[in-house]
């Protein structure tokens, strides 16, 4: 039961995390105008990975996409790449983990196969989370560098000293969404990896069962493996569980619905 719970929770946490990574990637507020000495501004600037926006106090908002690829800073391109890789890996991880869930039966899929898929999806979630955290951190570092490099007051102008306040940018909401989402995806991945250990078939020795045939006394070797008779289509060796009773983990449960906002 604990394994199923860990796997299910890992899946849900990763799902929320990846949804957050997608949301952060699409958000426009990666960097927002620093209102260090002017909390009420008539023109507010903010920027995302894909476009920059200006919101006037009149309520009018105008966004312009970055319609160039070559003209963009390499760091921004790197952040975009990291976030996209994170989303792609996360999406594949989700797809794999759906089939790996213990509560979902797909044909006669072995527990060992489910364990492998769980581990694969877990690793994908971990890498996805790390990509998102790295992307957001690179962008945050870029902001911090630019913030201190930009002088608050530059004096320019023809024929006199005219004050020009340079726009400085600080952390936007998307950075925090990205960090939290990346962390959740990472945690979900770790939980999937932990669940994988519980799913993997253990080479446990089971009690030897003695069968008596008329005239012959045949003892099956311990190890709990039933010798294949070649009867029927299944020629694989299967473990025999005493009394054929199912463990709690084996009981079939129906997948729960996850509303995702």
């Amino acid at each position: 039961m604990a394994v199923t719970a860990c796997q299910g929770l890992g899946f849900v946490v990763s799902l929320i995390g990846i949804a957050g990574i997608i949301a952060a990637t699409c958000m426009d507020q990666w960097s927002t105008q620093d209102l260090y000495n002017n909390p009420v501004t008539a023109v507010f600037n903010y920027q995302g990975l894909w476009r920059s926006c200006v919101r006037e106090s009149s309520g009018f908002t105008e966004c312009r996409g970055y319609f160039t690829l070559l003209g963009l800073p390499a760091m921004l391109q790197a952040v975009r790449a990291l976030m996209i890789v994170g989303i792609v890996l996360g999406a594949i991880g989700l797809l794999v983990s759906i089939f790996a869930l213990k509560c979902i039966r797909i044909g006669s899929m072995e527990d060992s196969a489910k364990a492998n898929m769980t581990l694969t999806s877990g690793i994908m979630f971990i890498v996805s989370g790390l990509c998102a955290i790295a992307g957001v951190s690179v962008f945050a570092n870029m902001l911090v560098t630019n913030f201190w490099m930009s002088t608050a007051n530059m004096y320019t102008g023809m024929g006199g000293m005219v004050q020009t306040v340079q726009t400085r940018y600080t952390f936007g909401a998307a950075l925090f969404v990205g960090w939290v989402a990346g962390g959740l995806t990472l945690i979900g991945g770790v939980m999937m990896c932990i669940a994988c250990r519980g799913l993997a078939p253990e080479e446990t020795n089971y009690k030897a069962v003695s069968y008596h045939a008329s005239g012959h006394s045949v003892a099956y070797k311990p190890g709990g493996f039933k010798a294949s008779t070649g009867f029927g289509s299944n020629t694989k060796n299967k473990k025999i569980y005493d009394g054929g009773a199912r463990t709690e983990d084996e009981v079939q449960s129906y997948p729960s619905k996850h509303d995702y906002v």
Epitope: N38, T41, V43, V54, S58, F60, Q163
Partner: antibody
Framework: QVQLQQSGAELVRPGSSVKISCKAS????????MNWVKQRPGQGLEWIGQ????????TYNGKFKGQATLTADKSSSTVYMQLSSLTSEDSAVYFC???????????WGQGTSVTVSS | DIVMTQSPSSLTVTAGEKVTMSCKSS????????????LTWYQQNPGQPPKMLIY???TRESGVPDRFTGSGSGIDFSLTISSVQAEDLALYYC?????????FGSGTKLEIK
């Protein structure tokens, strides 16, 4: 069409208060900020403040903070400006104006003349 | 607060003439985010409320004759009337629309000979 109809002229005593109104029509009243501007006789224009009727948010010019109070009534599509502790310096024409893109004021009321005299 | 300085304070021209008035701000009105200058021009006829002519320094408001042209960037702006008409006799104000509190210039009075 957009119209801003202001209340009539006021003659008030020094130290008293006055409340002037601006009734809007022809547009989505709650979706636009409304500005108030002061113009003393033969003088230029002075921005007093603005109110967003949608939620009652206000922004004031520091010079008028405490003296001017802006309110809005969505049911009647009317904004109000109350001026308190009036002095002769407050004798002016007060305009309401709708705030639009470019942080500009596109439609203006006809103005309300306030005269402070003993 | 941003100080807006308009010059000249008054202009006397003949009908059909081209006229240019200036407006200077104490701080740049150029927003780096969208490369727009937050300066608005208004025309006020005697006994009337102001009428918006130009916003974003150079964008003409709908219904405004194309003889009115706004130009400039940063701190220096101008309003040009290519061919003055009798109805253009008015006061012209520029306004800082970039930062609070919004401030107006002292105005340029246009008179027709």
């Amino acid at each position: 069409q957009v119209q801003l109809q202001q209340s009539g002229a006021e003659l008030v005593r020094p130290g008293s208060s006055v409340k002037i109104s601006c009734k809007a029509s022809g547009y989505a009243f709650s979706s636009y900020w409304m500005n108030w501007v002061k113009q003393r006789p033969g003088q230029g224009l002075e921005w007093i403040g603005q109110i967003y009727p949608g939620n009652g948010d206000t922004t004031y010019n520091g010079k008028f903070k405490g003296q001017a109070t802006l309110t809005a009534d969505k049911s009647s599509s009317t904004v109000y400006m109350q001026l308190s502790s009036l002095t002769s310096e407050d004798s002016a024409v007060y305009f309401c104006a709708r705030f639009v893109k470019g942080n500009a004021m596109d439609y203006w009321g006809q103005g309300t003349s306030v005269t402070v005299s003993s | 607060d941003i100080v807006m300085t308009q010059s000249p304070s008054s202009l006397t021209v003949t009908a059909g003439e081209k006229v240019t008035m200036s407006c200077k701000s104490s701080q740049s009105l150029l927003n780096s985010g969208n490369q727009k200058n937050y300066l608005t021009w208004y025309q006020q006829n005697p006994g009337q409320p102001p009428k918006m002519l130009i916003y974003w320094a150079s964008t003409r408001e709908s219904g405004v004759p194309d003889r009115f042209t706004g130009s400039g960037s940063g701190i220096d702006f101008s309003l040009t009337i290519s061919s003055v008409q009798a109805e253009d006799l008015a006061l012209y104000y520029c306004q800082n629309a970039y930062s609070y509190p919004f401030t107006f210039g002292s105005g340029t009075k246009l008179e027709i000979k």
